[in-house]
């Protein structure tokens, strides 16, 4: 296993619709053809997997049908979008990149993007 640098923004504020997008960029030392990207969430010292996708270079990222993540790739950049976020989902989202094929296997883990989610204010009751 060889180490690889992964860069991601330090902080992002999700949209009022609970959508957060950020780029995860990795310094590929070679010509990988198969890449696996995993998004981890760290909160209260607990780390959980949010979503993961394996893709062939030049192809779209394919997450599971029920995943809250979507993404696109371009060169050594992966543009990740996480949707359906609520205030309780605020936390540190870490991008993990693995170059699966061809060997050697490379692993890179970013410092994390602190995503803040603000629940929209409830609309005031209106009399008709």
């Amino acid at each position: 296993c060889k180490a690889m640098h992964v860069a991601q923004p330090a902080v992002v504020l999700a949209s009022s619709r609970g959508i957060a997008s950020f780029v995860c960029e990795y310094a590929s030392p070679g010509k990988a053809t198969e890449v696996r990207v995993t998004v981890l969430r760290q909160a209260d010292s607990q780390v959980t997997e949010v979503c993961a996708a394996t893709y062939m270079m030049g192809n779209e990222l394919t997450f599971l049908d029920d995943s809250i993540c979507t993404g696109t790739s371009s060169g050594n950049q992966v543009n990740l979008t996480i949707q359906g976020l609520r205030a309780m989902d605020t936390g540190l989202y870490i991008c993990k990149v693995e170059l699966m094929y061809p060997p050697p296997y490379y692993l890179g883990i970013g410092n994390g993007t602190q995503i803040y989610v603000i629940d929209p204010e409830p609309c005031p009751d209106s009399d008709f």
Epitope: V11, V12, S15, A87, T90
Partner: antibody, heavy 116, light 106 residues
């Protein structure tokens, strides 16, 4: 090294607007947020809101909603805070700061005086 | 909005003594920071995430607590530690500050 340099002191009349700038250097501007905090003379700190320089999304204090606008110019690594319909109780030192989980780097502060 | 109440309002201590500052929230808080401010200066971040020390902060400063009760402890007061200390919650919008605790020389 990380630096945040704010625009100079302003004197405004009630009802006017003020726009304070905050020029960042020494780091990747779009990777961080910019938070705005003010402090009235002899008083404590008041959070005004923040902007994600990465995507331009904003989160404002409820009491200032409708009067405040925070923006960024990523080409010059500068953040702006505009406050409209100024009142005498808006007289304060206005600080910008680099935000992630708390403000680790601060501007020097901009004194805004609202007086007729 | 979450109201943060700091106590005591003023703490009179001598250099070398231990300082314990309290910050109580009106409802549960998930993220809390502590700042130090000296007259005529911008605040300085000491602690984020309730217990993580910011870069360059001496280890005599420590933060603890969760939920609604948080504490900033200065194990041995140095002359430069006499200042006003603020807590800030940033887990629930609007983010809010406490009213501050002044640590003065006895």
């Amino acid at each position: 090294q990380v630096q945040l340099v704010q625009s100079g002191a302003e004197v405004k009349k009630p009802g006017a607007s003020v726009k304070v700038s905050c020029k960042a250097s020494g780091y990747t501007f779009t990777s961080y947020g910019i938070s705005w905090v003010r402090q009235a003379p002899g008083q404590g700190l008041e959070w005004m809101g923040w902007i994600s320089a990465y995507n331009g999304n904003t989160n404002y204090a409820q009491k200032l909603q409708g009067r405040v606008t925070m923006t960024t110019d990523t080409s010059t690594s500068t953040a702006y805070m505009e406050l409209r319909s100024l009142r005498s109780d808006d007289t304060a030192v206005y600080y910008c700061g680099r935000w992630v989980r708390g403000v680790e780097y601060w501007g020097q502060g901009t004194l805004v005086t609202v007086s007729s | 909005e979450i109201v943060l109440t700091q106590s005591p309002g003023t703490l009179s201590l001598s250099p070398g003594e231990r300082a314990t500052l309290s910050c109580r929230a009106s409802q549960s808080v998930s993220y809390l920071a502590w700042y130090q401010q000296k007259p005529g200066q911008a605040p300085r971040l000491l602690i984020y995430g309730a217990s993580s020390r910011a870069t360059g902060i001496p280890d005599r400063f420590s933060g603890s607590g969760s939920g609604t009760d948080f504490t900033l402890t200065i194990s041995r007061l140095e002359p430069e530690d006499f200042a006003v200390y603020y807590c800030q919650q940033y887990g629930s919008s609007p983010w809010t500050f406490g009213q501050g605790t002044k640590v003065e020389i006895k």
